[in-house]
């Protein structure tokens, strides 16, 4: 299933620890686009390999 995404709602402005929140409309869930140097579902881990 291909899902388009929106900006996250205000309810999830702090969802991603080091990145940008995107809301997957079809799945009805947030996702994170991590800033450089961070990994994890919520960009919670520093990428030690970066």
């Amino acid at each position: 299933v291909v899902s388009h995404f929106n900006d996250c709602p205000d309810s999830h402005t702090q969802f991603c620890f080091h990145g940008t929140c995107r809301f997957l409309v079809q799945e009805d869930k947030p996702a994170c686009v991590c800033a450089s140097g961070y990994v994890g579902a919520r960009c919670e881990h520093a990428d030690l390999l970066a």
Partner: antibody, heavy 112, light 107 residues
Framework: VQLQQSGAELVRPGASVKLSCTAS????????MYWVKQRPEQGLEWIGR????????KYAPKFQDKATITADTSSNTAYLHLSSLTSEDTAVFYC??????WGQGTLVTVSA | DIQMTQSPSSLSASLGGKVTITCKAS??????IAWYQHKPGKGPRLFIH???KLQPGIPSRFSGSGSGRDYSFSISNLEPEDIATYYC?????????FGGGTKLEIK
């Protein structure tokens, strides 16, 4: 994905109670957990939420002094603590994850 | 916090008929509205998210629409198992809020 809530509680006015909600099939750190109240013959009321990853909470204004939400990521469990109970707190309390996944509800009866 | 005004609070309709429930938000909620069916003794069941997206397993006779502050939820070809209370939920704001609920009865 499943949310298993603790059993029914009968409590005295003025007392406190702590309800639990244990998740299986997902990690509660992946998103927020919510609690909802339904009094007999009344509608659904959103109590608040917790981000289990860091403990941050948000409460609806009317529950600010009544409810405390906590989480234990090691047991994948969220908790709702209700204080200074009155007859107005007699209700079913539901936990939820995202919008689709709900526990079966816990009935709290406040009675002398 | 955002108020959700849901109407009507109750309605009665015939089997095979169609009903529409509305929710009006006190401010723009950017289509972040969900609709639930709730039956006694059970947890609420999500039918629609993000205004019009049907949850898996929900029949297409259920539908949702709207934008800005105004949203609606419709059931066509009513069946006996549709008897329940239906709620809207806005999840745009930091503090979620439910509508007051609509109790659906069959004539």
């Amino acid at each position: 994905v499943q949310l298993q809530q603790s059993g029914a509680e009968l409590v005295r006015p003025g007392a406190s109670v702590k309800l639990s909600c244990t998740a299986s099939g997902f990690n509660i750190k992946d998103d927020y957990m919510y609690w909802v109240k339904q009094r007999p013959e009344q509608g659904l009321e959103w109590i608040g939420r917790i981000d289990p990853a860091n403990g941050n909470t948000k409460y609806a204004p009317k529950f600010q002094d009544k409810a405390t939400i906590t989480a234990d990521t090691s047991s994948n469990t969220a908790y709702l603590h209700l204080s200074s109970l009155t007859s107005e707190d007699t209700a079913v309390f539901y936990c939820a994850y995202r919008r689709a996944y709900w526990g079966q509800g816990t009935l709290v009866t406040v009675s002398a | 916090d955002i108020q959700m005004t849901q109407s009507p609070s109750s309605l009665s309709a015939s089997l095979g008929g169609k009903v529409t429930i509305t929710c009006k938000a006190s401010q723009d909620i950017n289509k972040y509205i969900a609709w639930y069916q709730h039956k006694p003794g059970k947890g609420p069941r999500l039918f629609i998210h993000y205004t019009s997206k049907l949850q898996p397993g929900i029949p297409s006779r259920f539908s949702g629409s709207g934008s800005g502050r105004d949203y609606s939820f419709s059931i066509s070809n009513l069946e006996p198992e549709d008897i329940a209370t239906y709620y809207c939920l806005q999840y745009d704001n930091l503090l979620y809020t439910f509508g007051g609920g609509t109790k659906l009865e069959i004539k």
